[in-house]
C-alpha cells in the first residue's frame, strides 16, 4: 500500500571504495521523485539527494564522519508533482537498506606501485599511500592513516620469464625483496586487511616490471 | 555491561503528573535513540515514545502525544519521561529500552511501575 | 497505523516440541520486524531482528522468518528456559506489538 502510482524503491545497495560511498537502488522513477535519509544507530535521521530522479545518492560526507559507525539509509518516494502526499501509514512510502559500517566493509581500491628502486640485489618497491575522503583537522586522510596496522599489502613478484611467483607482505607501504642481479622482475600488490570478514582484498594492481619508467637501478 | 535502571515511578491522582528517569551505563548514551514502552497490568506492549540521540528528533504514540514529553540529557546519560494530565489507563509498568536507528530495542531496563489512582 | 496480529494466543507444549509462532501485519512491512520474550515480572528481551537475524547471544534454537505481511519465529526444540510469552514488533512505520503468545506447558 502506499501513495497512488508511487512505487517502493527495491534492490537498495551500497557502493563504496575507500569510503567513497554511494548508495543505489530500484525501480527508475516513472512520476515519481526519491529524497534519501541515512542515520547512525542514533536515530538522526539526516536528508540527502532531495526530490531527485536519479536511483543514486553519494553519501560519502555522511559516512566519513565516522567510518566505524554503523549507517542505515532509506529512500522516500513521493508522486512527482506532489511532494506533499503521503502513504496510508500517514507517511511517504519508503524501504531501508541494508546496514552499513564503512571500516568493515568499503571495498579496498586498486592499490599503485608508485615506485621500485634496485640496489644490488635488494629491490625497494613503494605502494601508493592512497588518499580518501575521510578528513581530520580539515585534512584528507589516507588509507594508511585510516588503516593503519588493520591494513597489509601483500607483493606478488617473479622474474619476467618465469611462472613461479613468490609473495612478500608488509604492515607499510614498502616492501624490501630479495632479486638475482641483472634479472629482470616483474610484481603486483594487493591490499589486505586480515581481520575483516568481507572484501578482505583488493583487486591487483597494475603489473610494474623492472626495467619501466618507474624503476631506478643502482649498484 | 549495558545496563538501563528505570527510577520515579509512584502512585499519582488522575489528572496529575510524574516524571520517569532512566539511568544508562555501559554503552555511549548519545550514539543511541532511546524509547520509553509500558506494559499495563496482564496487557501487552505498547509503545509511548522514542528519542534520537541527539534529541532533535522524537516520536509519540497517539495515546499520548500531547500529554507526555520524551527527553534525554547526554552529559549525565539519562533519559526521561515527563508525564502529565495522568490517566487511569496510563497505569503500567515502564520500561526504557535502547533503540537502534529508533526501530527496535536490543536492551531494557526492569522497568518502573506507575499507578493512576484516586 | 499498522496493525500486529499473532496467533496462537497461547500454545500449549512439551520440551523437545519445534513451536511456531505466526505474526501478520495489516500492510505489508519489508522485513522490520523484531521477536521479543518476556517471562513473567521480568522486562523483554530481543531475539530476532530484521525478520530473521538473530540477537547476539540468544540461542540457535531461535528463528526468524517472512517478509511483507507474514512472519514466523520458530523454536526447533522446546527448552524449559522457553516457556513465555512472545511479541512480534514492527518498525516500518513507528512501532506497533503484536498481542503476544503465551508458550505454556502441556
Known amino acids: 500500500s502506499g501513495t497512488t502510482n508511487t512505487v517502493a524503491a527495491y534492490n537498495l545497495t551500497w557502493k563504496s571504495t575507500n569510503f567513497k560511498t554511494i548508495l543505489e537502488w530500484e525501480p527508475k522513477p516513472v512520476n515519481q521523485v526519491y529524497t534519501v535519509q541515512i542515520s547512525t544507530k542514533s536515530g538522526d535521521w539526516k536528508s540527502k539527494c532531495f526530490y531527485t530522479t536519479d536511483t543514486e545518492c553519494d553519501l560519502t560526507d555522511e559516512i566519513v564522519k565516522d567510518v566505524k559507525q554503523t549507517y542505515l539509509a532509506r529512500v522516500f518516494s513521493y508522486p512527482a508533482g506532489n511532494v506533499e502526499s503521503t502513504g496510508s501509514a500517514g507517511e511517504p512510502l519508503y524501504e531501508n537498506s541494508p546496514e552499513f559500517t564503512p571500516y568493515l566493509e568499503t571495498n579496498l581500491g586498486q592499490p599503485t606501485i608508485q615506485s621500485f628502486e634496485q640496489v644490488g640485489t635488494k629491490v625497494n618497491v613503494t605502494v601508493e599511500d592512497e588518499r580518501t575522503l575521510v578528513r581530520r583537522n580539515n585534512t584528507f586522510l589516507s588509507l594508511r592513516d585510516v588503516f593503519g596496522k588493520d591494513l597489509i599489502y601483500t607483493l606478488y613478484y617473479w622474474k619476467d620469464s618465469s611462472t613461479g611467483r613468490k609473495t612478500n607482505t608488509t604492515h607499510t607501504n614498502e616492501f624490501l625483496i630479495d632479486v638475482e642481479k641483472g634479472v629482470s622482475y616483474c610484481f603486483f600488490a594487493q591490499a589486505v586487511i586480515p581481520s575483516r570478514t568481507v572484501n578482505r582484498k583488493s583487486t591487483d594492481s597494475p603489473v610494474e616490471c623492472m626495467g619501466q619508467e618507474k624503476g631506478e637501478f643502482r649498484e | 555491561e549495558v545496563q538501563l535502571l528505570e527510577s520515579g515511578g509512584g502512585l499519582v491522582q488522575p489528572g496529575g503528573s510524574l516524571r520517569l528517569s532512566c539511568a544508562a551505563s555501559?554503552?555511549?548514551?548519545?550514539?543511541?535513540?532511546m524509547g520509553w514502552v509500558r506494559q499495563a497490568p496482564g496487557k501487552g506492549l505498547e509503545w509511548v515514545s522514542t528519542?534520537?540521540?541527539?534529541?532533535?528528533?522524537?516520536y509519540y504514540a497517539d495515546s499520548v502525544k500531547g500529554r507526555f514529553t520524551i527527553s534525554r540529557d547526554n552529559s549525565k546519560n539519562t533519559l526521561y519521561l515527563q508525564m502529565n494530565s495522568l490517566r487511569a489507563e496510563d497505569t503500567a509498568v515502564y520500561y526504557c529500552?535502547?533503540?537502534?536507528?529508533?526501530?527496535?530495542?536490543?536492551?531494557w531496563g526492569k522497568g518502573t511501575t506507575v499507578t493512576v489512582s484516586s | 497505523d499498522i496493525q500486529m496480529t499473532q496467533s496462537p494466543s497461547t500454545l500449549s507444549a512439551s520440551v523437545g516440541d519445534r513451536v511456531t509462532i505466526t505474526c501478520r501485519a495489516s500492510?505489508?512491512?519489508?522485513?522490520?520486524l523484531a521477536w521479543y520474550q518476556q517471562k513473567p515480572g521480568k522486562a523483554p528481551k530481543l531475539l530476532i531482528y530484521?525478520?530473521?537475524s538473530l540477537e547476539s547471544g540468544v540461542p540457535s534454537r531461535f528463528s526468524g522468518s517472512g517478509s511483507g505481511t507474514e512472519f514466523t519465529l520458530t523454536i526447533s526444540s522446546l527448552q524449559p528456559d522457553d516457556f513465555a510469552t512472545y511479541y512480534c514488533?514492527?518498525?516500518?512505520?513507528?512501532?506497533?506489538f503484536g498481542g503476544g503468545t503465551k508458550v505454556e506447558i502441556k
Open positions: 514488533q514492527q518498525y516500518k512505520s513507528y512501532i506497533t
Open positions: 555501559g554503552f555511549t548514551f548519545s550514539d543511541y535513540a
Open positions: 529500552a535502547k533503540a537502534p536507528y529508533g526501530y527496535y530495542m536490543d536492551v
Open positions: 528519542i534520537s540521540g541527539s534529541g532533535g528528533l522524537t
Open positions: 500492510q505489508s512491512i519489508s522485513s522490520w
Open positions: 530484521k525478520a530473521s
